[in-house]
Every structure is written in structure tokens, then in C-alpha cells.
């Protein structure tokens, strides 16, 4: 079986919880901005 990891911890999405622990960053939403030379520019 492929390694299984649940979705990352509690955030509210229209009263829907992200219920399962998983890697940090999953289901966190996109970063707004552009990465240039290691600096995020809005």
C-alpha cells in the first residue's frame, strides 16, 4: 500500500473541519504574492 497520511489539522472551511492530522501545509491555502530572490512581493 502507498503510505497514507490524513489531512492536516483543524481549520474551518464553511463549518467543515479539516479533521485528520497530516503534513503541515496541507489544506492551508495558497500564499498570496510572488517569490523573487527569496522575498515574497505582494
Amino acid at each position: 500500500d502507498a503510505e497514507f497520511r490524513h489531512d492536516s489539522g483543524y481549520e474551518v472551511h464553511h463549518q467543515k473541519l479539516v479533521f485528520f492530522a497530516e503534513d503541515v501545509g496541507s489544506n492551508k491555502g495558497a500564499i498570496i504574492g510572488l517569490m523573487v530572490g527569496g522575498v515574497v512581493i505582494a
Epitope: D7, F20, A21
Partner: antibody, heavy 112, light 112 residues
Amino acid sequence: EVQLVESGGGLVQPGGSLRLSCAASGFTFSSYGMSWVRQAPGKGLELVASINSNGGSTYYPDSVKGRFTISRDNAKNTLYLQMNSLRAEDTAVYYCASGDYWGQGTLVTVSS
Amino acid sequence: DIVMTQSPLSLPVTPGEPASISCRSSQSLVYSNGDTYLHWYLQKPGQSPKLLIYKVSNRFSGVPDRFSGSGSGTDFTLKISRVEAEDVGVYYCSQSTHVPWTFGGGTKVEIK
């Protein structure tokens, strides 16, 4: 409103197959891991399959491994459970669950 | 797999009186992000499980404040400050820190 609606249960003979479906609505289905949990008559809750948000990773306990297959169609907001080589001990109510929300369940009866 | 052990198995209660259910896990439920994914469900007769408490002590949407959760590491407690007739059913603890998602065996709460 979050809703999970199962279908596809019924009476099947030992060795037979069934495919359960779970129609999800009210949330961004493609962003969440999903599971199937079963409950035999008068018994507790048993996880039978889990799948991550993009369908790339799955988990099965030994009791169903090699017989059951979980899958999802994120375009249709639907979760599936293909059950093959069914046994009498697979008789149970099968719930589609996201952890915080559960469907109403669908009864699978395996009997000759 | 993480084993979840609940006690008592059965709990006769008097309306208006407090009640308490214990849950112990075979390993720590603290995840690497510091959160503890220990939850409590109530399954009323003929219904699917409903989430009461998530992450040890957080009441889910619509859950009355007479329900509270506490604990840490491997030992957890669900308390009902004043039991009402509608609280009867089977209570399950559950963990989703570790794969697979696992459940306690249940505690049946009934009115004396």
C-alpha cells in the same frame, strides 16, 4: 450545509461484489480526506478504508485488504467503495465519513 | 494501530446529575504540530455518529455547553454537567493523530 449521502447497499451472496457510493455536498470535497467506516449489528465502529484528498494514498485494515478498494471522483464530488469477495462478517451498516460529518449509512447484508 | 480503551462500558445516569466517561490511548495523541486529535461522538439509537467534541475540548457546532472534554497525552475525559433524557446513546472516543483512524469500544449511557 455539509451532506454525505451513501447508496449501493443491499443483499449479496457470499463471494459476491457491491459498489457503494457517497455523494458529498456543502464543502470543497477535493480538499479533504475521506473514509468508510462500518458497524456490524450491535457492534462498534470499524474503519474499513481511507483515502487522501487527491486519491493518491489509501489505507486498508488487514480485514479487508485485497478485497475492498476505495476511490474518489473529485469532479463528481463522490466517494466509492468497491467490495469484492464478500463474506458474512462484512455484514454491517457502512458509513461515509469525513470525521466531523457522517452519512446516514447504507446496509450491506452478505447471506446465502 | 492505536488502541482506544473506554470506561465504563455502561453508564446508568439520573437526569440532572453529572456523568463522566474515560478514554485512554495506547500511545500519546500529541501530533508534531502540538495539537491532540482526540474526539468524542454520540450515536443515538438508529442514527449515525455525531461529533460532539473535537481536539480534546472543542465543542462542535450546535453541541450544548453541558458537554465538555478534557485530558492530555493518553488520558481523556468527557463530562456531561447535567444529563438530559436526550443524551442517551453510545459515546465513542476516537483519535485521528495517527493512521489509521481508530475508535474506542463505546460507552452506553442510559437513564436509570
